[in-house]
């Protein structure tokens, strides 16, 4: 008998193993990325792994901790801030979540001269935001809505605010509206360059409708939440800016910042503060109706203590054919002349470009142009311009960086990325020193994510941040899914896809299909970056196609395709995903009895009306935490891209647009609408109105509520959501467990 | 290991002048310029930053010595100086060098004395 052995065991066929749920909810393949926190042109600090704060020179190559692990336990510290003058260190501790970027915290002030925590006249407790002054060691922090100030972390506080009060006034941190939907930030306050003056904001929220919400918490009694939360149409918090002299902060007291004549004649938002300098500050302000954008830059005079905001200093933006700016209105970057500035806006041909302003917005150099768009704009310095774009290869869904050399003339362009790890590395984003004497490149993909160390000068890698080594190592016995990006060509309209396949795909095979979307305005989810994630076990595991799709009103490839879903929220965005779906079938390796649809917030929304379009197209679909009517989000986002739920206005749009009034069409499919009950951001009145419109129109559906959970539906929720929404699909596709 | 050798204080009179010298050795210095620091302890009192240079010579100062106090560095002798003018009363401490921020374990030299008699 003649034995001959079978397949090698350990041949990488047999040793290689499909992702499973339990590797996602576990984070089992999560990347780290490193953002140095840059102390100086050449010096940066990072808490290591065992929570030493280290501090890190580059140029000579050594290191050092500057404050113990053991200090930071001895407050339960997450979290610290190094003074500009390297005397104190903030230490936060208590962390205690609001909403998006906002929290509380306690703070201890560390003084490193003589390794001792400072005592007396001690911070109170729990601060909203607290912060450095750019120069020396002088604090401000805002406290039960009111802003202080410490000359030196021992002094007893100046109170610079008195009439802050519990969602009614807030000095110096946003509410809920300007936080979420204008600033993206938990602070309303900025020091300016040199820390003479602070410039904050206040905004008044007297009169705006509050949302009330059940928490149920484990007491007898559910507690009631109230948030000032203005809805479409409804009032607006009032915003005012002052600035105060930090030096002799009682001499004058704070001075309000005017507001452009022609912005303060109807409602208006304040959209962000930029210092030029420390007697030059410049301010955007928005119309309520979001398509007129004023840049004010206002100096101040000495002799009247006053902020002087000359007409001739007013810079208007205006689109014709859409809302003001992208996502937000972009901000300035001031060159060293303070006056003239770069900034990002839509060049004649519609796309979003880098243009210098120098006296006028009618007289503004475009620096960059081309049919794809400028995305970022890192750091101006006297030689060079360091920017984010697209335009690499013609993918929108790449971020590379440039430089460009503004000292010389005609200015020339280098790409410092493309061609650096280029099939690992075509998505990045990059942190810089002072002076950009040397920056950090952190990858996101698609390759495993790489953060990078380089000198600013000749743009050479001084040396690897962070590899994920450990990570690369994990994945070699994983069957990871293939992903290709590409394009579809309908209609004289570009929809890029991103499509995840099975580890063995047979084109000549049949696969059920999944579509991810989220579709909002501004959005893109088509990017080269790494990701281990739910869809990603869908495909390796379940051996289902995932696709993804950008539609109209996505970002990143021009006016037209951005502002093509103006007034029309819900139409466009939905048509898309159907047409591509149509195509994606032409391609021949989707079972077509087997197409799902699921989105999370706009992606709820898009992923209902698709569901309920009568295209017989999608056997079941799932909508986490969907806007349901835009009569129900907030104003500052809606109305950007609806206008105003009135007669005169675009009241019909609003009610043509809401998956209530599509109750009828749910018959036919099968729907999982899932919401948490505490969601502050698009409220479970959402969900309650369209399961009311279901149970009317007497359809069929399952529904899952997450009691006390956010619009994020976090921690444990995540592992039941993951582990509900699987069974669903699998039991959609016929699927065995 | 972090070694400072601080020198050059004394004994003078108000609205004089002194200058301090500080030598670092060890390994951290070894390759090049740290960012370094002039501290200071008057009696009964906690030691505190009086100012500060990095490798690239860029100058911070306490705001009680600002326009009286310079400090420079001389960085191929490790050497870090601070020139005092205008002294005040007030001024009187022991005065040391050290990495700024300082390093954890801390590592101090013996200081110099310098007292100002009005």
């Known amino acids: 008998i003649v034995l001959r052995p079978s397949r090698v065991h350990n041949s990488e066929e047999n040793t290689m193993r499909a992702l499973t749920l339990k590797d996602i909810l576990n984070g089992t393949f999560s990347y780290k990325t490193f953002f140095p926190n840059w102390i100086s042109g050449q010096e940066y600090l990072h808490q290591s792994a065992d929570n030493n704060i280290v501090l890190y020179n580059i140029e000579t190559g050594q290191s050092y901790t500057i404050l113990s692990n053991r200090t930071m336990k001895s407050v339960n510290a997450s979290n610290y801030g190094l003074s500009p003058d390297r005397q104190f260190v903030y230490l936060e501790s208590d962390y205690s979540k609001l909403w998006r970027y906002s929290y509380t915290a306690t703070y201890y002030i560390y003084d490193l001269s003589n390794g001792e925590f400072v005592r007396g006249n001690e911070l109170p407790r729990p601060i909203q935001y607290l912060c450095w002054s750019p120069v020396g060691s002088k604090l401000a922090y805002v406290y039960q809505n009111n802003i202080y100030l410490k000359q030196r972390p021992g002094d007893p506080p100046f109170q610079i605010t008195f009439n802050g009060r519990e969602n009614k006034i807030f000095n110096g941190i946003p509410d809920w509206v300007y936080e979420e939907e204008m600033l993206a930030t938990k602070y309303a306050l900025w020091w300016s360059p040199n820390g003479k003056f602070l410039a904050y904001a206040e905004f008044n929220d007297t009169d705006i409708p509050v949302i009330a919400y059940s928490y149920y918490g484990d007491e007898q009694y559910p507690r009631t939440i109230n948030i000032p939360y203005p809805k479409a149409g409804a009032k607006n918090p009032v915003v005012r800016i002052f600035i105060i002299d930090t030096t002799y902060p009682a001499y004058v007291g704070p001075q309000e910042v005017p507001v452009p004549a022609m912005i303060a004649s109807s409602d208006y938002y304040f959209s962000w503060l930029t210092w030029v300098t420390d007697e030059r500050v410049c301010l955007q302000w928005l119309k309520r109706v979001q398509n007129v954008s004023v840049l004010s830059i206002c100096d101040f005079r000495e002799d009247w203590q006053t902020w002087d905001c000359p007409k001739t200093q007013e810079h208007i933006e205006e689109s014709r054919t859409g809302w003001a700016g992208g996502f937000f209105v972009s901000t300035p970057v001031f060159s060293y002349d303070a006056i003239s500035y770069y900034k990002i806006f839509s060049d004649k041909d519609g796309y979003k470009h880098i243009h210098y302003i120098k006296d006028t917005v009618e007289n503004a150099i475009q620096i960059t142009s081309g049919k794809w768009e400028a995305i970022n704009i890192f750091r101006v310095t006297q030689d060079s311009l360091f920017y984010s774009s697209n335009e690499f290869e013609e993918y929108p869904g790449r971020r590379n960086i440039y430089r460009i050399s503004i000292g010389s003339y005609p200015p020339s362009k280098k790409c410092v990325t493309c061609h650096l790890r280029k099939e690992r590395c075509q998505y990045y984003t990059a942190s810089f020193s002072d002076y950009a004497k040397y920056y950090a490149l952190v990858c996101y993909g698609p390759g495993i994510p790489i953060s990078t160390l380089h000198d600013g000068r000749t743009d050479q890698e001084i040396k690897i941040l962070e590899e994920n080594k450990e990570l690369e190592n994990a994945l070699k016995n994983i069957q990871l899914p293939k992903e290709e990006i590409k394009k579809l060509e309908v209609d004289e309209i570009t929809l890029w896809y991103k499509m995840i396949l099975p580890p063995q795909f047979d084109r000549s095979k049949k696969y059920p299909l999944l579509i991810q979307v989220y579709g909002g305005p501004c959005s893109q989810s088509v990017r080269s970056v790494f990701a281990v994630n739910w869809i990603s076990y869908l495909a390796s595991k379940e051996g289902m196609v995932i696709a993804l799709v950008d539609g109209r009103g996505t970002a990143f490839q021009g006016d037209k395709l951005l502002y093509a879903v103006y007034r029309k929220l819900g139409v466009y965005e939905v048509e898309d995903q159907i047409t591509a779906v149509r195509k994606f079938i032409e391609m021949g390796f989707i079972d077509e009895k087997r197409i799902a649809i699921w989105g999370w917030s706009y992606g709820g929304y898009v992923s209902s009306l698709a569901l309920a379009s009568g295209t017989g197209l999608f056997k079941c679909g799932i909508a986490v935490a969907p806007v349901s009517s835009w009569e129900y989000y907030a104003s500052v986002y809606t109305e950007r891209f609806m206008g105003l739920p009135t007669k005169d206005d675009n009241l019909e749009h609003y009610k043509n647009s809401t998956v209530m009034a599509r109750a009828e069409y749910f018959r036919n499919v099968d729907y999982l609408l899932i919401h948490g009950t505490a969601d502050d951001n698009v409220h479970f009145q959402n969900s309650a109105q369209i399961a009311k419109a279901l149970v009317n129109a007497q359809v069929d559906f399952q529904a899952m509520w997450y009691s006390d959970q956010n619009h994020g539906l976090s921690g444990l929720s995540t592992n039941h959501l993951y582990t509900h929404m699987t069974h669903f699909l699998k039991q959609c596709f016929s699927l065995s467990d | 290991q972090v070694q400072l050798q601080e020198s050059g204080g004394g004994l003078v009179q108000a609205g004089g002048s002194l200058r301090l010298s500080c030598v670092a050795s060890?390994?951290?210095?070894?390759?090049?310029?740290?960012?370094m620091g002039w501290y200071r302890q008057a009696p009964g009192k906690q030691r505190e930053w009086v100012a500060g240079?990095?490798?690239?010579?860029?100058?911070t100062y306490a705001d009680s010595v600002k326009g009286r106090f310079t400090i420079s560095r001389d960085n191929a002798e490790n050497t870090v100086f601070l020139q005092m003018n205008n002294l005040k009363s007030e001024d009187t401490a022991v005065y040391y060098c050290?990495?700024?921020?300082?390093?954890?374990?801390?590592?101090w030299g013996q200081g110099t004395q310098v007292t100002v008699s009005s």
């Open positions: 050290n990495l700024w921020p300082p390093s954890r374990p801390d590592h």
């Open positions: 060890g390994t951290i210095f070894s390759s090049g310029a740290m960012a």
């Open positions: 240079i990095t490798g690239s010579r860029t100058t």
